[in-house]
Amino acid sequence: ASTQSPSVFPLTRCCKNIPSNATSVTLGCLATGYFPEPVMVTWDTGSLNGTTMTLPATTLTLSGHYATISLLTVSGAWAKQMFTCRVAHTPSSTDWVDNKTFSVCSRDFTPPTVKILQSSCDGGGHFPPTIQLLCLVSGYTPGTINITWLEDGQVMDVDLSTASTTQEGELASTQSELTLSQKHWLSDRTYTCQVTYQGHTFEDSTKKCADSNPRGVSAYLSRPSPFDLFIRKSPTITCLVVDLAPSKGTVNLTWSRASGKPVNHSTRKEEKQRNGTLTVTSTLPVGTRDWIEGETYQCRVTHPHLPRALMRSTTKTSGPRAAPEVYAFATPEWPGSRDKRTLACLIQNFMPEDISVQWLHNEVQLPDARHSTTQPRKTKGSGFFVFSRLEVTRAEWEQKDEFICRAVHEAASPSQTVQRAVSVNPGLAGGSAQSQRAPDRVLCHSGQQQGLPRAAGGSVPHPRCHCGAGRADWPGPPELDVCVEEAEGEAPWTWTGLC
């Protein structure tokens, strides 16, 4: 195990459990989680005499690190005395030391509430030249407290002599003031009032609020995926609220149906994003039949920081329907990547744009994370198209060289699915890993350099081309093929690609 410095904890009894006439008491110090041995524990007992005993180190079974306890027994006027346990761990570094200072016993105490208040803006909503932050430490059992101001986590050099303490009944309150220049306040730094009390830390932080007019909060309401709707038959819709400023107020999402009928129970998820904003997602199961029959679902969002409620609604897309055409093909072997191939699937001319794309191998659906599928884009006509890309390994195609690209779409008949099979090495029996088959036809086309695929930009072969070696059981173009045009005095060239 690597070197690990110890965590140090004071061990004390509750004051109420120590008899008032006790002439001596024992307190302890726990050093745990260190490696390797040893640690050295020493005690500062002030003016009192004490005897110490350090117990042999024990091994923590899971980590293999060590733990040890040192006990101090003191006699005399111990009640008012503070004791310091000093733990040194030279393997961590020659000067590694952790000091814990504490009294013999811990009292029941009421912890403080820490709250930062800030001075108001002027009447016109502008910041004055200086901003006052007031740290209110309230409602704690009287005792020593330390107040520290931090700026972006760094201790500030602040005159704390201005801090004042008052007592109300059995509880005390303290306040400390910090004055900042407008420049510092507007710099978007975070200011923290950190209070240490009874060995615990309490804090509150503040910074210049974002403009009161929120920017960029957006809500989106998705339709169910065709896969969930037609295959799993458990469609859901999702209301997504993004770019919310995290705050103490919660986002309220309410679902309803235009028909007034009740909605199912929804599930909700909140996620803090890296940029500090909050994303809230609510997912509602909907009835397959209700959705297909055209029910409208509404998601209403309210939040303290949103001036207005906002509502999103969704329903089945209206308009013409067209089933997708599916074409699957494999890329040729690329130098340096003999053990990997990319399969591509072009799905086009479908309407409406809602589509689910899956890849299957060995009759098993591959995880969505395995493939990458574009968002639907409009074709030059009225339909939509997507591309899906799947990387496969030699081990997979040697096991079975048939991969299926399946599109799930409401206009596909008979079962809302259209699929095409593709092989890495088409035409090879058993799918054994041999080189790409030789093209069996020749494509001649003027104005093209030999060997360059002319459909790279998504075009198709010349109208006078015809396709060969395709699978006869496929309606439409074959997946990976060679096209031919009779040459008219031109040098022939071959092209293997999508017809």
Partner: antibody
């Protein structure tokens, strides 16, 4: 049916203050965001302020500081306090209810109360 | 801040005419755009909300269209009671500019 009735308008001297009230009936006020809109004589509509169902408020940039919107759901009333009145504040002030949908517009308006600032 | 520019500021038309009023936003509006009709001495009345949804009780000759920054209100066949001033308003929850209303379009009898 939904009703919004504004009151509190009138003739006031420059520098004075007014508190406009909007009594709401026929619906649950606490469910709706509420807005004040004003219209100077012969001019277009001008948004003043909005208060959401949580009681948080926003103002048009020019209104910040002198205008204060508030609501008392228990009294079914929305208020607009205007301080340091100027001649340019002369207008009909409308109290308006945002659609329950939210972010969709104003589906009910009061008849308005006329504020005239003149010495 | 989003600014709403309405055009034309006035239009003369006859009963039965098709009238289109446009409203351009200085930034894309992701939430609702509303259209109002106002007659002299009356408060405005909601015609269209959420870009294109007809408010309750509004005749179907009124329609709203558009997205992003360009919006339009169309009256397919102008009726005598339609002579009024029309305003667009962005009801975007994320923006509170100096004025969320367009400048207005007065539809007058030719």
């Amino acid at each position: 049916q939904v009703q919004l009735v504004e009151s509190g308008g009138g003739l006031v001297q420059p520098g004075g203050s007014l508190r406009l009230s909007c009594a709401a009936s026929g619906f649950t006020l606490s469910n709706h965001d509420m807005t004040w809109v004003r219209q100077a004589p012969g001019k277009g509509l001008e948004y003043v302020s909005i208060i959401n169902t949580y009681g948080n408020h926003w103002y048009a940039n020019w209104a910040s500081g002198r205008f204060t919107i508030s609501r008392d759901n228990s009294k079914n009333t929305v208020y607009l306090q205007i301080d340091s009145l100027r001649a340019g504040d002369t207008a009909t002030y409308y109290c308006a209810r945002e659609t329950h949908h939210g972010s969709s517009g104003i589906d009910h308006w009061g008849q308005g109360t006329l504020v005239t600032v003149s010495s | 801040d989003i600014q709403m520019t309405q055009s034309p500021s006035s239009v003369s038309a006859s009963v039965g005419d098709r009238v289109t009023i446009t409203c351009q936003a200085s930034e894309s509006i992701y939430s609702g755009l509303a259209w109002y009709q106002q007659k002299p001495g009356q408060p405005p009345k909601l015609l269209i909300y959420d870009h294109s949804t007809l408010a309750s009780g509004v005749p179907s000759r009124f329609s709203g269209s558009g997205s992003g920054t360009e919006y339009a209100l169309t009256i397919s066949s102008l009726q005598p009671e339609d002579f009024a001033t029309y305003y667009c308003q962005h009801a975007d929850y994320a923006h509170h500019s100096d004025n969320v209303f367009g400048g207005g379009t007065k539809v007058e009898i030719k």
